[in-house]
């Protein structure tokens, strides 16, 4: 089976790399525009220059192209705790990230939120906080891991998964209740 090519890919594949087929005349291959520019007018004929114009402020193209418009620069999402790492230029989109001691959690492919790295209170750092992953904690005895925080076994209810980790403490609590001591 031959993979289906979109019209644009089909047209481009007829021309050598770095060129594209003229939309009105498929016998002409025009030179693509450099990154940081966009297509204003197709080349008038073979061997003649494509009319490329520089992207305006607030827009960019990051690779050679024959786009009729530059792409709008991304904005860092304040509500998600994002900060600007580097601003948008004509040939590169805005780069957004998180502050120091924070990590990115991706809710979807192109949406991330910044959260503070866990400090592992009542535990030890098993794996340090990374750009896209929270600290991995190991809890001290008498504590169990809940939502990446070390919580006292006194907060462990019988139905929760902590029962195995907190078994001695639970038995002690049960024993105290059974003996009727105050």
């Amino acid at each position: 089976l031959v993979p289906h090519l979109g019209d644009r890919e089909k047209r481009d594949s007829v021309c050598p790399q770095g060129k594209y087929i003229h939309p009105q005349n498929n016998s002409i291959c025009c030179t693509k525009c450099h990154k940081g520019t966009y297509l204003y007018n197709d080349c008038p004929g073979p061997g003649q220059d494509t009319d490329c114009r520089e992207c305006e402020s607030g827009s960019f193209t990051a690779s050679e192209n024959h786009l009729r418009h530059c792409l709008s620069c991304s904005k860092c999402r304040k509500e998600m705790g994002q900060v600007e790492i580097s601003s948008c230029t004509v040939d590169r989109d805005t780069v957004c990230g998180c502050r120091k001691n924070q990590y990115r959690h991706y809710w979807s492919e192109n949406l991330f939120q910044c959260f503070n790295c866990s400090l592992c209170l009542n535990g030890t750092v098993h794996l340090s906080c990374q750009e896209k992953q929270n600290t991995v904690c190991t809890c001290h005895a008498g504590f169990f891991l809940r939502e990446n925080e070390c919580v006292s076994c006194s907060n462990c209810k019988k139905s929760l998964e902590c029962t195995k980790l907190c078994l001695p403490q639970i038995e002690n609590v049960k024993g105290t209740e059974d003996s009727g001591t105050t």
């Epitope: 999402r77 304040k78 509500e79 998600m80 959690h105 809710w107 939120q113 959260f115 503070n116 929270n134 939502e147 990446n148």
Partner: nanobody
Framework: EVQLLESGGGLVQPGGSLRLSCAAS????????MVWIRQAPGKGLEWVSH????????YYADSVKGRFTISRDNSKNTLYLQMNSLRAEDTAVYYC????????????WGQGTLVTVSS
């Protein structure tokens, strides 16, 4: 006690429209960015849209961009999701939630409203 109550779901034909509402109480609604998430039958949670505190900045998943509009009325403590040009793949339970603060989990979200798109 934080409460979020969604309404407005129902059965609609492909191409149709629905407007979901989420009534909020138990917290200062105007101080919280809000989120619509959905869960299609047998699938995981999908982030649909979110809106900042004042209703200025919005975000839409690619799958709903140009068809859905999120808005809020802080004077009524209500979040909305206007859904147009509905498709079969929009069939899901829709939940509103407060944007998480402390970690990547939804501490506060509603019971959901079912949207079914079918002819």
């Amino acid at each position: 006690e934080v409460q979020l109550l969604e309404s407005g779901g129902g059965l609609v034909q492909p191409g149709g429209s629905l407007r979901l509402s989420c009534a909020a109480s138990g917290f200062t609604f105007a101080h919280e960015p809000m989120v619509w998430i959905r869960q299609a039958p047998g699938k995981g949670l999908e982030w649909v849209s979110h809106i900042d505190r004042v209703g200025q900045d919005t975000y839409y998943a690619d799958s709903v961009k140009g068809r859905f509009t999120i808005s809020r009325d802080n004077s009524k403590n209500t979040l909305y999701l206007q859904m147009n040009s509905l498709r079969a793949e929009d069939t899901a339970v829709y939940y509103c939630a407060m944007l998480p603060k402390r970690g990547p989990r939804f501490d506060y979200w509603g019971q959901g409203t079912l949207v079914t798109v079918s002819s």
